[in-house]
């Protein structure tokens, strides 16, 4: 199965010489970035990137690891230290605060410095930190948020919200005492904290009053509106902008994205998180790639540029379930969105960053043969004389005892999208991991992304590259042809 040409040293020497030639030609751009895009793979640690690369290659009937992901083509790479102020291993709220606002916070808080305390409403005021997206809006750019989770979820919320509890999606989730103290739910903050031009993802139910049936699942009461304050936040948002449009399915999204009269677009395609890519009804729900394209079509109309946050948010969910098939297929769709965005933008004026908020206790090992399925078994048996998969988790729901022992596994089981890879420790949900994650960069000022950095550095690179606060005196030449 090994390609014959790879047995020849010339193959590797020639390949490396080409890579070296490309590296020698890299020239740091001295211009400012007109546009900023941050692609956030939630839970996309380096082991996830590697396994997804192999799967993407195998999907194309190649052996696997020799394939390039779209993110692999970005010329600059750094490592990001993901810890939060109070935890070695962080959550998506504290990390969002770091890479979107440039300040580290505490576990499960969003858009607040570490002086704020989880779940303590009265520690909110005065501890708010401002996102790069907010600063981009103040500078006259258009801004957008795209995610496969709820738009009120921790990662996207870092772009616009300030909350001591990431779980306060709608007012029904906020304790009465906190509501009385003035703490607002995340959905309310989505429409009131700042003017966001494009909002695409899941999370319909948090926007509508309790008892409002969902348009897609009208007979399922649990999918309907959750709000106790009687507010229709979508209606309130539409009333703010003459060119605003709300859509809830793929067809409407594609129409709206091509309509020149639409200036603001909100698309909420599921009551909660969007479906996994493998379960998505492609007639009703758009893919992450399609949402990204729609957002770029609208945002790129602004001559002053744009800021766009794009999240592959369910990579994380697949890992928490210990279902590597789900995590990896979500990662591939995330990478497809990166590739599409690259086709629709220019690296001359657009700084694109790809990173993860944190990793997962997901491993890839066992000396599998080249070309063997990424979902397959390691050669040979373990000490208990049973097979084991090359993909495993350190902890999680994949820990199962059968007759007091680890169950055997066959290849026909391990390939199933429902299969949970085994783990060493039993938990209801697999956990995040604390190792550094990669940051990939391309475009103006991408060369600043180097070395081992705090996660907060990401927000500062974006702000500096686009000459946003606090770097308005950035002393970067505007790109030729940039209009104001």
């Amino acid at each position: 199965i090994i390609p014959v040409e790879e047995e020849n040293p010339d193959f590797w020497n020639r390949q490396a010489a080409e890579a070296l030639g490309a590296a020698k030609k890299l020239q740091p751009a001295q211009t400012a970035a007109k546009n900023l895009i941050i692609f956030l793979g939630d839970g996309m640690g380096v082991s996830t990137v590697t396994a997804a690369r192999i799967l993407k290659g195998q999907k194309k009937d190649k052996l696997g690891p020799e394939t390039f992901l779209a993110m692999d083509r970005f010329p600059y790479v750094a490592l990001s230290k993901t810890y939060s102020v109070d935890k070695h291993v962080p959550d998506s709220g504290a990390t969002a605060t770091a890479y979107l606002c440039g300040v580290k916070g505490n576990f499960q808080t969003i858009g607040l410095s570490a002086a704020a305390r989880f779940n303590q409403c009265n520690t909110t005021r005065g501890n708010e930190v401002i996102s790069v997206m907010n600063r981009a809006k103040k500078a006259g750019k258009s801004v957008g948020v795209v995610t496969t989770t709820r738009v009120q979820h921790a990662s996207p919320a870092g772009a616009y919200a300030h909350t001591v509890n990431r779980n306060w999606y709608s007012d029904a989730d906020v304790p009465a005492s906190a509501r009385q103290e003035g703490c607002q739910d995340i959905a309310t903050q989505l429409i009131s904290n700042m003017d966001i031009d494009v909002i695409l993802g899941g999370g319909r139910k948090y926007m509508f009053p309790m008892g409002t049936p969902d348009p897609e699942y009208p007979d399922d009461y649990s999918q309907g509106g959750t709000r106790l304050d009687g507010k229709n936040l979508v209606q309130e948002w539409l009333a703010k902008h003459q060119g605003a449009r709300y859509v809830w399915n793929r067809t409407e999204l594609l129409q709206a994205s091509l309509d020149p009269s639409v200036t603001h677009l909100m698309g909420l395609f599921e009551p909660g998180d969007m479906k996994y890519e493998i379960h998505r009804d492609s007639t009703l729900d758009p893919s992450l790639m399609e949402m990204t394209e729609a957002a770029l079509l609208l945002l790129s109309r602004n001559p002053r540029g744009f800021f766009l946050f794009v999240e592959g948010g369910r990579i994380d969910h697949g890992h928490h379930e210990s279902r590597a098939y789900r995590a990896l297929t979500e990662t591939i769709m995330f990478d497809d969105a990166i590739e599409r965005a690259g086709q629709l933008t220019s690296e001359e004026d657009t700084l694109s960053l790809v990173t993860a908020d944190h990793s997962h206790v997901f491993s890839f090992g066992g000396y599998p043969l080249r070309g063997s399925s990424i979902f397959g078994l390691a050669p040979g048996k373990a000490r208990d004389r049973k097979a084991y998969t090359v993909l495993l988790y350190g902890n999680g729901p994949g820990y199962v005892l059968k007759d007091g022992a680890r169950p055997d596994v066959t290849e026909s089981e391990s390939g199933s999208p429902e299969y949970r890879q085994q783990s060493a420790v039993p938990l209801d949900g697999e956990t995040h991991a604390g190792e550094d994650v990669a940051v990939f960069a391309r475009g103006p000022q991408a060369h600043l992304v180097h070395g081992v950095q705090e996660q907060t550095f990401i927000a500062h690179v974006m702000a500096f590259a686009a000459c946003l606060e606090p770097y308005t005196a950035c002393d970067l030449a505007p790109r030729a042809g940039t209009t104001d």
Partner: nanobody, 121 residues
Amino acid sequence: QVHLVESGGGLVQAGGSLRLSCAASRRSFSEYAMGWFRQAPGKEREFVAAIGWSGVIEYADSVKGRFTISRDNAKDTVYLQMNSLKPEDTAVYYCAAGLGIRVVSQTPAYWGQGTQVTVSS
């Protein structure tokens, strides 16, 4: 989800031919590699043939030159043309789908219910 439904099995004499079909329910059928496996009574399920997204094809040594796999993306269907059948080809034949030929030939994601092929001598 991908639902797979096989058809075309039956009883045939040694040296005869059969054509198995497998219809898939998902619109993105062309993204998947498709394969056939078989399980004879009392034996493990074994790989027979697979056809990838790119059209690349693999066969088990035991069926090379006798069986031909093909696909019609417009009809979301994969076929297995079986010629020069032998009694040892008797088995339940399963259709499978996976992300690429490497995956489908080793660890398919989706399986059909199977169709019985019996070759009499």
